[in-house]
Amino acid sequence: MNGRVDYLVTEEEINLTRGPSGLGFNIVGGTDQQYVSNDSGIYVSRIKENGAAALDGRLQEGDKILSVNGQDLKNLLHQDAVDLFRNAGYAVSLRVQHRLQVQNGPIGHRGEGDPSG
C-alpha cells in the first residue's frame, strides 16, 4: 500500500576545502533556469566521485544551497551562481538545506481533519 510522502527539511553548514580538481559537484537552478517549480534556488545536481564534496560526505544530490561564504544565493542568474562558486577561494562554507523524504502512513488511513489528496 502506498503512503503519503512528506519531507523533513533540515539546514546544515558544510565547510569544504577545495581539492586538486575543485569542489567536485554540479549545480542547477537560478532565476533563468528554474529547476524546481516556482523556485529559482540553486540545487546540487551531481556529486563527483572522489571530489572534495564526495570525500566530505555531507553534501547530497538534491540539496539546496542557500549561501556560499555567507553570500545569499537568492535571485541569482545561473551563471552568476557558477562564478560565485568558482571564485569562492580555497576554504568554502556552504549553508545547505537537506530535504529528506519521509513516509507518512498508508493512504486510506488518514486521521480526522487530515487533508485528503
Epitope: 575543485g22 559537484f25 554540479n26 542547477v28 533556469q33 545536481s45 571530489g51 545561473h78 557558477v82 568558482r86
Partner: nanobody, 127 residues
C-alpha cells in the same frame, strides 16, 4: 534517466562537411550540459566539444578549433556538431555525452568522468 541517440555519421571525403545530431530524452533538456567525444581506432576516447545548458558557453579541443561548431536547439532537445574541413585523422566513432547541471569547477568539460550519460556513438570515416 537520460537517453542519447546520435545520428549523421557516414563516409565523407577529406575537405568535406558533416553535421552530427544527438537527440536527448528522459529529462528536462535545458538542465543538461552536453559534450561530444570521439574514439579513433586504437586510441583513447578524446574530448571534442562542449556546450552549456543555454548554448552561451562552448569549448573545443585544439585539434578541431575553427573547423567544428557545437550548438543546441533546446526546443528540439537536440545538440549538433557541425564538422567542416574534415581530415582523415577525424575518422572515429563520435559519442554524445550529457551531465546534469554545470560544474562549479573550472576545466572539467573535457573530462569524460564528468558525464553521466552516453550515447552509442556514430561512425565518421574521412577518406
Amino acid at each position: 534517466d537520460v537517453q542519447l541517440v546520435e545520428s549523421g555519421g557516414r563516409l565523407v571525403q577529406a575537405g568535406g562537411s558533416l553535421r552530427l545530431s544527438c537527440a536527448a530524452s528522459g529529462r528536462t533538456f535545458t538542465h543538461l550540459n552536453m559534450g561530444w567525444f570521439r574514439r579513433a581506432p586504437g586510441k583513447e576516447r578524446e574530448f571534442t566539444a562542449h556546450i552549456n545548458w543555454s548554448g552561451g558557453s562552448t569549448n573545443y579541443a585544439d585539434s578541431v578549433k575553427g573547423r567544428f561548431t557545437i550548438s543546441r536547439d533546446n526546443a528540439k532537445n537536440t545538440v549538433y556538431l557541425q564538422m567542416n574541413s574534415l581530415k582523415p585523422e577525424d575518422t572515429a566513432v563520435y559519442y554524445c555525452a550529457a551531465t546534469l547541471g554545470d560544474s562549479v569547477d573550472l576545466d572539467s568539460d573535457a573530462d569524460p568522468r564528468g558525464y553521466d550519460y552516453w550515447g552509442q556513438g556514430t561512425q565518421v570515416t574521412v577518406s
